[in-house]
């Protein structure tokens, strides 16, 4: 678990096809916000907006193992 928040700025402008994997970190003792961190296919990590409807949809599909999320 992270010992502090990792994300301050977030984006929702990401295409699901560019996402290799997703990590969803719930609120905890050390960070009072949900953080969604995507690892892109080029290896970079990026913070996604957990409240954006399209990100919620991507998260649901990715965690369900549906790689065709668009």
């Amino acid at each position: 678990a992270e010992l502090r928040c990792m994300c301050i700025k977030t984006t929702s402008g990401i295409h699901p096809k560019n996402i290799q994997s997703l990590e969803v970190i719930g609120k905890g003792t050390h960070c009072n916000q949900v953080e969604v961190i995507a690892t892109l296919k080029d290896g970079r990590k990026i913070c996604l907006d957990p409240d954006a409807p399209r990100i919620k949809k991507i998260v649901q599909k990715k965690l369900a193992g549906d790689e065709s999320a668009d």
């Epitope: 700025k9 050390h30 960070c31 916000q33 970079r44 913070c47």
Partner: antibody, heavy 126, light 107 residues
């Protein structure tokens, strides 16, 4: 110019609350955490917590969790720290400070607080 | 919660001398250790961040080193304006913690 400007000194009675403001200008408000740090007379620095100007989510030092509330107003780039149930030991200078800048890319390499407000003296006395 | 221990508490030196300040963490904080200078009646000022990275506008005589749990701030040649209190601070994890400070005074 780039600055954090805090509200003026306050004198409060024990049991009361105080709300200190910190207005940011000259930089991208949403790229920096805003921290609150206090310093009792002749003592060291004590971290109270911080707030994300983006989400408004605040993280508090366990010591103050039941008494402190941090909020922000993005329209005026102002952050507020309210401390309730004041006691004499809360007499201190309260500073806001920024940490950043950060982008959309998470990192485990963190910046120090490179910009501080001028401080607000809060005196708690009956 | 991490504890940062600074030593010595007071350092008595003359202008032109070299100052070496120590900060020890109770557990590893990677390199997320920063150094601040504070003068009476003023807010702290960031000198060094992420152990050894320089801050714009800070004289080159200030340098930092270390990693993990042991860190050092070095002032290569003390100037009259360098006599102040120095704090280390970590933000590898929250709560952020500061050391108790080292006062550098004129001998």
């Amino acid at each position: 110019q780039v600055q954090l400007v805090q509200s003026g000194a306050e004198v409060k009675k024990p049991g009361a609350s105080v709300k200190v403001s910190c207005k940011a200008s000259g930089y991208e408000f949403t790229s920096y955490w805003i921290h609150w740090v206090r310093q009792a007379p002749g003592q060291g620095l004590e971290w109270m917590g911080n707030i994300s100007p983006n989400s408004g989510s605040a993280n508090y030092n366990e010591k103050f969790k039941s008494r402190v509330t941090m909020t922000r107003d993005t329209s005026t780039s102002t952050v507020y720290m309210e401390l309730s149930s004041l006691r004499s030991e809360d007499t201190a200078v309260y500073y806001c400070a920024r940490e950043g800048p950060y982008s959309y890319y998470p990192s485990r390499q963190y910046y120090g607080s490179d910009l501080w407000g001028q401080g607000t003296l809060v005196t708690v006395s009956s | 919660e991490i504890v940062l221990t600074q030593s010595p508490a007071t350092l008595s030196l003359s202008p032109g001398e070299r100052a070496t300040l120590s900060c020890r963490a109770s557990q590893s904080i990677s390199n997320n250790l920063h150094w601040y200078q504070q003068k009476p009646g003023q807010a702290p000022r960031l000198l060094i961040y992420y152990t050894s990275r320089s801050v714009s506008g800070i004289p080159a005589r200030f340098s930092g080193s270390g990693s993990g749990t042991d860190f050092t701030l070095t002032i290569s040649s003390l100037e009259p304006e360098d006599f102040a209190v120095y704090y280390c601070g970590q933000n590898n994890e929250w709560p952020e913690v500061f050391g108790g400070g080292t006062k550098v005074e004129i001998k």
